[in-house]
């Protein structure tokens, strides 16, 4: 080993070196949080870039660059360091059009903390391992969601467009002519029934156990779906999104109430099955796989 390499190895394995890098990263993160940084922070920025460059040079000299098994670029954690340095020099010395977009990559410096703190390294390692192990569970989840999305599509397609429409039409008004003239929410409220505080017209259905319209209103299927058109089972993709929402229990009770009002209370069976299978079983299966991967990584 050349004297330069010996010195590099000594520096690399020294605990103070790790402490220096960790402090640099944390200080850099503090500086990045500044809203309107003063001019002198520019020099501090150069100092940080210098320290990171020095760290990488030490690692390269100690371990080699890329030829060989334990060299600098063979460790994925060093890829991050390499990218950080490359972007630091790019944003500083190369005149690129949209520099602010490239400056976003400075945030990657915060991720360097992971490679320095051993506990964090374990957690992130477990996370990466779990993603690999999750592939089978993800396939199962997507398959189950797809099956139920197709069932939902068949059962509820178009149902969430049902609305309570005012009976007293003018002599020459038709549904079509009204829908063409409706622009503001006030216009809609003139013809459709809205519950107090609701942003969507009251849903209704044509089956006996679905929601009925109040006196003076008839159930019609027209206009857009609730929640600005984002809640529906009209296409496979929207149905899939609705099922994903059920699985993650993201305000699912609203979707449940809307669908039951439009389709009928019998369909609660569909929601019971989806919640039990998707929300209770699949979510916990995912958690189990993550827990297993973390346990393996710890060992």
């Amino acid at each position: 080993f050349s004297p330069l390499r010996r010195i590099s190895i000594k520096i690399l394995v020294h605990s103070l070196f790790s402490m220096l890098i960790m402090c640099t990263i944390l200080t850099n993160c503090i500086f990045m949080t500044m809203n309107n940084p003063p001019d002198w922070t520019k020099n501090v920025e150069y100092t940080f870039t210098g320290i990171y460059t020095f760290e990488s040079l030490v690692k390269i000299l100690a371990r080699g660059f890329c030829v060989g098994e334990f060299t600098f670029l063979r460790d994925p954690w060093n890829w991050l360091d390499f990218v950080v340095i490359v972007f630091a020099y790019l944003t500083e010395f190369v005149n690129l059009g949209n520099v602010s977009a490239l400056r976003t990559f400075r945030v990657l410096r915060a991720l360097k903390t992971i490679s320095v703190i051993p506990g964090l390294k374990t957690i992130v390692g477990a996370l990466i391992q779990s993603v690999k192990k999750l592939s089978d569970v993800m396939i199962l989840t997507v398959f189950c969601l797809s099956v139920f999305a197709l069932i939902g599509l068949q059962l509820f397609m178009g149902n969430l467009k049902h609305k309570c429409f005012r009976n007293s039409l003018e002599n020459n008004e038709t549904l079509e002519s009204i829908m063409n003239t409706l622009e503001s929410e006030e216009d809609f409220r003139k013809y459709f029934y809205y519950l107090e505080g609701s942003k969507d017209a009251l849903l209704c259905g044509f089956s006996t156990d679905s929601g009925q319209c109040p006196e003076g209103y008839t159930c019609v299927k027209i206009g857009r779906n609730p929640d600005y058109g984002y809640t529906s089972f009209d296409t496979f993709s929207w149905a899939f999104l609705a099922l994903f929402r059920l699985m993650t229990q993201d305000y699912w009770e609203n979707l449940y109430q809307q669908t039951l009002r439009a389709a009928g209370k019998t369909y609660m069976i569909f929601f019971v099955v989806v919640i039990f299978l998707g929300s209770f079983y699949l979510i916990n299966l995912i958690l189990a796989v993550v827990a297993m991967a973390y346990e393996e990584q710890n060992q």
């Epitope: 397609m157 429409f165 038709t174 319209c213 008839t218 159930c219 299927k221």
Partner: nanobody, 120 residues
């Protein structure tokens, strides 16, 4: 294609009665509101009466107490016209808000009209 077919029109003497009927032909998933309109010569079309699936019924002031609208479980609506007057002479149209199939939106459908003439 859905069509509304009216029948029952004709010539009747003042004070007489007529029963108009309107049936929806073709594929119908759901009929919402069914109504009768009329258009007298040289006048605008006006609403006579309507009936909703929930049983809401409304009549024009000029026909209240004389005309009765009803609908049956099939795709039919009726207008029973009693104590007819010369001013009831008009072309009577049937109109329905209906869904041809479960995937289509509700639309407005009109019949071709049936002529009712009240004269002595």
């Amino acid at each position: 294609e859905v069509q509304l077919v009216e029948s029952g029109g004709g010539v009747v003497q003042p004070g007489g009665s007529l029963r108009l009927s309107c049936a929806a032909s073709g594929p119908v998933f759901n009929i919402n509101r069914m109504a009768w309109y009329r258009q007298a010569p040289g006048k605008q079309r006006e609403l006579v009466a309507y009936v909703t699936p929930t049983g809401d019924i409304s009549y024009a002031d000029s026909v209240k107490g004389r005309f009765t609208i009803s609908r049956d479980a099939s795709k039919r609506v009726y207008l029973q016209m009693n104590s007819l007057r010369p001013e009831d002479t008009a072309l009577y149209y049937c109109r329905a808000l209906l869904q041809p199939d479960r995937y289509s939106n509700t639309r407005t459908y009109w019949g071709q009209g049936t002529l009712v003439t009240v004269s002595s």
